[in-house]
Interface confidence: low
């Protein structure tokens, strides 16, 4: 498939201009290849019109010009004084012209109405107002007023000053009759169809004497903008509709075959299936305007989106709107990740998140999509040392490895964990990332005491238990803190007993704590990295006591305690409300390079590349241990 | 970082083929596009051929298309540029790129030499 886009259609009338924008892939190779504009003839072949090499053919000579933007990936073609003849089949292109590398755009060009002497154009938006105004002198104040759209060679009555309403305008139109100082009277239809569209004539009085004017009405249907955005990246679709229809329910959808358009969001709570975890519909403004972000863009994305408003939350006749032309690159800069991720119960995940390498000095987040009311993507975690008070000792956020990758860490799993994370930066917005993660059922592979406590001023040693399938792997305990977790010395005592099954290599390495100090309370992780890859973690929580007996505590699998009490904490946590989204500024883009379906066997829990049709239920609270 | 070594350059005949290697290490091969460039004694370095991460869309130079062919081996680590019916003036150092269409990463060339 060509990775050139463009306006499929494009109308216009004669004497007009149009501007036609094509996008390309704005790789080196592109940036300065040949572009091109040409006719295709019947036989197949294409002329060329018009190139970025400076050729012009006579037929566009003096009213045409194709200017190449590098930086955005874009050419524009601008034609003027356009005629019948050049409406026609043509292809903007780079290269040469037989290549493929190119898209097809269609050029109407029509002749312009045919109006009579004295006649008032009114140019207006699908799903709109329009308001007709219409003189009268005098003599025909007290007469009937009336409008009337010419259908064929009749005019057919719309409406009249006694009452009546064509059944076509019912509920959408009424005429006004100003103070008779004005003598005018004006008809005023609202929610406009493009079937409205034609020649009206207003009239006062009924004889020979009365006053007529003629209208033409031309309803507009919205030019699709064109967006051209990379498979596995992401879009976003900013509506404003005005406010008139501020307090009008809004929507997004996709149009298919004929005139439907699915709805993908609305803000009636409606959201279709496929863009379950990687949609936000963001909050309205004042004037009724507001947007809509999708990540992971997948092939079958690609389409025309309209938004619009309407009561029913969906596309009805007469609904103002917006369009878009999506077009998904798939050669897209953004290299594939896994879309899920599965985690056992109790046990860790290790996600590996792209963002732009060229804005290493972001700030990174990491957020929980939320699908209730319209989308919402909490923050969980910063690089900047913030995490929400319910993931305490059990999220990091690592920088590791860097080069367009960082890590979040998640232990102590339980099914509330379930659901859509979001990876994003401060930085491109182009980048956001979507994983799902699931909790399948086993046992975790490492092995710690539940809760420890340890005495002041004596020695604490804290096993941990790594089966052989990580006798390859380095080993680890590390401090938790709000900014990651800090390295500590561990010792390695040997091969573990705690594994039925499991040969010499299976490994128990204790982290000692000397002379206890209330500084030592906290969160200890042990786990299991290759490099600056991470796998599975294991999390213990340390109190630190007074002394009530002498000595050293050295603490085994079975002494501790096994199922810590788990404490549900409220809901009065630092929360960026819907900041992932409202400020465009959180968001990541760029290629990430590590490729993470190379992750550590078993230390990453499995991992799923295909994106997934099922889904998790969002968390809404998290467990810490005291 | 990706590390990429060429092979399969050599002195060939006019009208000859060579196939030329080019095999990367590091995991993030397969997120990148490949590319070949070539050198000859006294010019600049031009551009040969390009083939997108996934294989789907390749580029040629003018000068080369129809007689070269560009192709990867994901799974292998490996592109490979297939060049028939060679001419005098394809002779230069060759060498392979990881994300050329942004000057990423490069070899250290291998020598085609072209006898008429």
């Known amino acids: 498939k060509s990775p050139i886009f463009g306006p499929e259609e494009v109308n216009s009338v004669e004497g007009n201009s149009v501007s036609i924008t094509c996008y390309y892939p704005p790789t080196s190779v592109n940036r300065h290849t040949r572009k091109y504009w040409c006719r295709q003839g019947a036989r197949g072949g294409c002329i060329t019109l018009i190139s970025s090499e400076g050729y012009v053919s006579s037929k566009y000579a003096g009213r045409a010009n194709l200017t190449n933007f590098p930086e955005n990936g874009t050419f524009v073609v601008n034609i003027a004084q356009l005629s019948q003849d050049d409406s026609g089949r043509y292809k903007c292109g780079l290269g040469i012209n037989s290549r493929g590398l190119s898209f097809d755009v269609s050029l109407e060009v029509s002749q312009g109405p045919g109006l009579l002497n004295d006649t008032k154009v009114y140019t207006v938006d699908l799903g709109r107002t329009v308001t007709i105004n219409c003189p009268f002198k005098t003599e025909n104040a007290q007469k009937r007023k009336s409008l009337y759209k010419q259908i064929g060679l009749y005019p057919v009555l719309v409406i009249d000053s006694s009452g009546y309403v064509n059944p076509n305008y019912t509920g959408r139109i009424r005429l006004d009759i100003q103070g008779t100082g004005q003598l005018l009277f004006s008809v005023v239809i609202n929610q406009l169809r493009l079937s409205d569209a034609g020649q009206y004539l207003c009239q006062a009085g009924d004889d020979s004497n009365s006053n007529k004017k003629n209208a033409d009405l031309q309803v507009l249907k919205p030019e699709p903008e064109l967006v051209y955005e990379d498979l596995r990246g992401s879009v976003t679709f900013h509506c404003a509709l005005g406010p008139e229809v501020a307090n009008v329910a809004k929507f997004l959808c996709r149009q298919s075959s004929g005139e439907n358009c699915d709805v993908v969001v609305n803000t009636l709570g409606k959201r279709a299936p496929a863009f379950e975890g990687r949609i936000l519909l963001n909050p309205q403004d004042k004037d009724g305007s507001f947007s809509v972000v999708i990540t992971g863009l997948r092939k079958e994305d690609a389409g025309r989106y309209l938004c619009g408003a309407h009561s029913d939350g969906q596309l009805q006749e007469g609904s103002p709107i917006q369009a878009w032309q999506l077009f998904v690159n798939e050669e897209s800069t953004i290299p594939r990740s896994p879309t899920v991720v599965k985690g056992v119960a109790g046990s860790s995940v290790a996600v590996l998140c792209p963002y732009n390498r060229k804005e290493s000095k972001s700030i990174k987040y990491w957020c929980l999509w939320e699908g209730a009311q319209n989308g919402r993507c909490p923050l969980l975690v910063d690089s900047e040392g913030w995490v929400k008070a319910q993931y305490e000792g059990r999220l990091s956020l690592l920088e590791e490895p860097g080069n367009g990758t960082f890590t979040v860490i998640l232990n102590q799993l339980t099914s509330r964990d379930a659901g859509f994370y979001w990876c994003l930066t401060n930085g491109d917005t182009l980048w956001r990332t979507t994983v799902e993660i699931k909790i399948i059922e086993g046992e975790p592979n490492l092995k710690v005491p539940g809760n420890v406590t340890a005495v002041l001023g004596e020695t604490l040693k804290v096993p941990c238990h790594f089966p052989c399938k990580f006798s390859s792997y380095e080993k680890y305990w590390c401090k938790w803190n709000n900014t990651g977790c800090q390295a500590l010395p561990s010792q390695d005592e040997g091969p573990s007993k705690a594994f039925v099954n499991c040969d010499e290599n299976s490994r128990l390495v204790s982290l000692t704590l000397n002379l206890v100090t209330r500084a030592d309370e906290g969160w200890y992780w042990c786990g299991v990295k290759q490099g600056h890859f991470y796998g599975e973690t294991a999390a213990v929580y340390v109190a630190v006591e007074e002394r009530k007996a002498a000595g050293s505590r050295d603490v085994s699998l079975a002494k501790a305690d096994a199922a810590p009490d788990e404490k549900v904490l409220d809901s009065g946590f630092r929360e960026i409300e819907n900041k992932a989204i409202q400020d465009p500024r959180l968001f990541a883009e760029e290629k990430a390079v590590a490729d993470t379906r190379d992750q550590a066997d078993g230390s990453r829990a499995s991992v799923d590349s295909g994106s997934s049709e099922e889904q998790g239920g969002s968390s809404r609270h998290h467990h810490h241990h005291h | 970082q990706v590390q990429l070594v060429e092979s399969g350059g050599g002195l060939v005949q006019a009208g000859g083929s060579l196939r030329l290697s080019c095999a990367a290490s590091?995991?993030?091969?397969?997120?990148?596009?490949m590319g070949w460039f070539r050198q000859a004694p006294g010019k600049e370095r031009e551009f040969v051929a390009a083939?997108?991460?996934?294989?789907?869309?390749?580029y040629y130079a003018d000068s080369v298309k129809g007689r070269f062919t560009i192709s990867r081996d994901n799974a292998k680590n490996t592109v490979y540029l297939q060049m028939n019916s060679l001419k005098p003036e394809d002779t230069a150092v060759y060498y392979c790129?990881?994300?050329?269409?942004?000057?990423?990463?490069w070899g250290q060339g291998t020598q085609v030499t072209v006898s008429s």
């Open positions: 790129a990881a994300d050329p269409f942004n000057q990423g990463y």
């Open positions: 590091g995991r993030t091969f397969s997120s990148y596009a």
């Open positions: 083939i997108t991460w996934n294989g789907g869309t390749t």
